[in-house]
């Protein structure tokens, strides 16, 4: 009896959908695996007789409720199928946006770049897919614990009237208000402000 794959899960970030599993202990030799997806009542092979422990399902529609399955094989024997269900638009992880930060005196000027949809030729982004897409920005004085959050209206934001000659750290994530779903935070970007440019009267 061939044991089934273990810890079967979908690792999906920005619609790059990788089904992953672990090979079970099997004394007779090396196992291979076949992974399939359900397409209008018929299971279709996606990865056949692979020695890998993952399979790329990124071509699946972003909007479908998909049934995927994987089994282990050895010679003419095979395990039972292990099934999972997956809806990319609901289940994919929203990766961190890109961010450009520029210091202008006592202000930080930020521009945000929505994560690109993985594996497509053209420059569609997660913002295209999700109508309610917005950004959360978190910033703080470097070395302190108190963090401030804002929700920019656009793909850019300016933090004004900051303390001069002070290092501020900023990070951004995508947020979907209609789904109450937050993406991953970007790595913090820390920049030092310069002088206050206001002219005394």
């Amino acid at each position: 009896m061939v044991p089934p794959p273990e810890n079967v899960r979908m690792n999906s970030v920005n619609f790059k959908n990788i089904l992953q599993w672990e090979s079970p202990a099997f004394a007779k030799g090396n196992l291979t695996f076949t992974a399939q997806y359900l397409s209008y009542r018929i299971f279709q092979d996606k990865c056949m007789n692979t020695t890998l422990t993952e399979c790329d399902f990124s071509s699946l529609s972003k909007y479908g409720d998909h049934t995927l399955r994987v089994r282990a094989e050895f010679a003419d024997e095979h395990s039972d199928w292990v099934n999972i269900t997956f809806c990319p638009v609901d289940d994919t992880i929203i990766g961190p946006p890109g961010m450009q930060v520029e210091v202008l005196a006592d202000s930080l000027h930020m521009r945000f770049l929505a994560p690109k949809i993985e594996n497509e030729y053209e420059t569609w982004t997660m913002k295209n897919v999700y109508n309610s897409w917005t950004y959360n920005v978190q910033y703080w004085k470097n070395g302190t614990d108190e963090k401030f959050q804002i929700t920019p209206q656009y793909d850019f934001e300016v933090l004004r009237n900051l303390e001069p000659w002070t290092t501020y750290c900023v990070q951004v994530r995508g947020f979907l208000p209609d789904r109450n779903k937050a993406g991953e935070w970007s790595e913090p970007v820390c920049e030092q402000t310069t002088h206050d440019e206001t002219v005394p009267s």
């Epitope: 972003k62 909007y63 594996n119 030729y121 569609w124 295209n128």
Partner: nanobody, 126 residues
Framework: QVQLQESGGGSVQAGGSLRLSCAAS????????MGWFRQAPGKGREGVAA???????RYADSVKGRFTISKDNAKNTLYLQMNSLKPEDTAMYYC????????????????????WGQGTQVTVSS
């Protein structure tokens, strides 16, 4: 909300022609991969032809040289020109779309398209 509406089906004699149309609404049409599928009674739904947002096309072997897929971005309409029709082309024909898609995956399977029309019937008699 994305909506697809097929038209142009009907009955025709073997060797004849039909042109199917799929009017799309509710999205930026040029950003979609689209396809025509068909389903004969008692059979599965199979891919007939597909066109990516960059205009590249693919056909099932059974229709190559007889069917032509095209799209008119200005009219938000997808077409399937079917020539030299055969009785085995008899089926319900469905239009499908997948948004924010390029040619990266060469989509041809039902599970690779997220939005579907209601279908239009094509009947070819011998």
């Amino acid at each position: 909300q994305v909506q697809l509406q097929e038209s142009g089906g009907g009955s025709v004699q073997a060797g004849g022609s039909l042109r199917l149309s799929c009017a799309a609404s509710g999205y930026t049409y040029s950003s979609y991969c689209m396809g025509w599928f068909r389903q004969a009674p008692g059979k599965g739904r199979e891919g007939v032809a597909a066109i990516d947002s960059d205009g590249s096309t693919r056909y099932a072997d059974s229709v190559k040289g007889r069917f032509t897929i095209s799209k008119d971005n200005a009219k938000n309409t997808l077409y399937l020109q079917m020539n030299s029709l055969k009785p085995e082309d008899t089926a319900m024909y469905y239009c499908a779309a997948e948004p924010y898609c390029s040619g990266g995956y060469k989509r041809t399977m039902v599970a690779e398209f997220g939005y579907w029309g209601q279908g239009t019937q094509v009947t070819v008699s011998s």
